[in-house]
């Protein structure tokens, strides 16, 4: 006999990266007929919702009107049908951005290079931080993590035209509190590629990470729950 129900999906709308003082909705999708949903924050009960009528609802929303560092962290949810509880969802890492300062992003040898040249991004932030994140805009979003006292290096290695695009970086004060985004740096890669072994090795997510970050909740954009959960896990771990 089944002792638990399947775990629900958890995600954030419009995004798990939330600018300070902006609103965010944490969504939990379980099964029709669930009489209670619980949202847990850092391992403790945070909020409860009892959908009405339960047989017509399989998703609940927990609204945070004013994001701040105290609300940033790891969330999970569970639901109950009758007396039977579900497995907990995967962890959702909710990040507050636009904290404190703005890093500076630069690229060496320059913003325009020839395919095959080695390229390194530098993200610098003079305030107390040791972790930095480099994000590439576009449908195929690349995320890299780097460390340093005031500056982190992000070596891309020999670049191809696939590395073309606009990059931004964040300083991270902890796993869930990030700085303002840097000004964008546009990397242009010219030249035909003869060596196909130069394909980029960055992790790729099939969604527009930065574009979604810029969206507001008014768009009501629905994201693929599993994808965003997966993105958050990769980015923050």
């Amino acid at each position: 006999q089944q002792q638990t129900l399947p775990k629900p999906f958890i995600w954030a709308e419009p995004h798990f990266m939330v600018p300070k003082e902006k609103q965010v909705t944490i969504c939990c999708q379980g099964n029709y007929g669930a009489v209670e949903y619980q949202l847990h924050f850092e391992g403790s009960l945070f909020a409860v919702d009892r959908p009405k009528p339960p047989e017509r609802i399989n998703k609940v929303q927990f609204y945070i009107p004013d994001m701040n560092s105290r609300m940033a962290g790891q969330y999970s949810c569970i639901y109950r049908v009758g007396e039977l509880w579900s497995e907990p969802s995967n962890l959702l890492d909710l990040v507050v951005t636009e904290m404190y300062d703005t890093p500076t992003l630069s690229v060496h040898p320059g913003p325009e290079v020839i395919s095959g040249e080695k390229v390194t991004f530098y993200c610098r932030l003079d305030t107390a931080t040791s972790m930095f994140l480099l994000l590439k805009e576009g449908r195929s979003s690349h995320v890299q993590r780097g460390y340093g006292k005031v500056q982190a290096e992000f070596p891309l290695g020999p670049v191809t035209t696939a590395h073309r695009g606009t990059y931004r970086c964040f300083g991270s004060y902890n796993n869930h509190a990030w700085s303002f985004p840097s000004e964008p740096v546009k990397l242009l890669v010219t030249g035909d590629i003869e060596n196909t072994s130069l394909a980029p090795e960055d992790p790729t997510f099939p969604a527009d990470t930065w574009g979604t970050y810029l969206l507001t909740t008014e768009t009501g954009l629905q994201k693929d729950h599993a994808l965003w959960d997966h993105t958050a896990q990769n980015l923050l771990r």
Partner: antibody, heavy 118, light 107 residues
Framework: EVQLQQSGPELVKPGTSVKISCKTS????????MHWVKQSHGKSLEWFGG????????SYNQKFKGKATLTVDKSSSTAYMELRSLTSEDSAVYYC???????????WGQGTTLTVSS | DIVLTQSPATLSVTPGNSVSLSCRAS??????LHWFQQKSHESPRLLIK???QSISGIPSRFSGSGSGSDFTLSINSVEPEDVGVYYC?????????FGPGTKLELK
Amino acid sequence: EVQLQQSGPELVKPGTSVKISCKTSGYTFTEYSMHWVKQSHGKSLEWFGGISPNSGGTSYNQKFKGKATLTVDKSSSTAYMELRSLTSEDSAVYYCARRDFHSSFDYWGQGTTLTVSS
Amino acid sequence: DIVLTQSPATLSVTPGNSVSLSCRASQSISDYLHWFQQKSHESPRLLIKYASQSISGIPSRFSGSGSGSDFTLSINSVEPEDVGVYYCQNGHSFPLTFGPGTKLELK
């Protein structure tokens, strides 16, 4: 020690072609792009173009469109620039220069003097 | 194309004095500006990278400053061997361009 050794001076006739070489040593040839810079007598420096030995990718200054072809021979760690349809305007000193990925042109060849005259 | 303008065209200086050479870009190039020295009958030599970063082996009397479109190369206490032409170079975008140069000579 990093060295860029260029081929000797050339005296050629108008309308012909010439191929200048730049033999490198002291570093991994494929890790740095190689660029070519023109300096007419008593004038400033003009970037002709660059090539990445790693990929064969090239970038040319459109001002000199069709004038040059950049190639490399990885087996001998040598870069080449072929100049065609030469005129007296092409008479100059041509430098090869390595572009460091953490700065700019950090090592230069000694220059090759090209004289185009009938 | 990014056009670099250098001033003055010629600079006459007494050894031991300090000088400043100017380079102005036709558009903002952040700090992607490099300085070269070329002595007579020699190849150019990289002096300063990224507007203000020093190069190993270059005397400390050479320093750079500026960002955006206005840049300065300073030589603190000029030595006789500093005679030559000084070029700034745009490292921001292709085509990579050089300024027309500033000729440094001794009085």
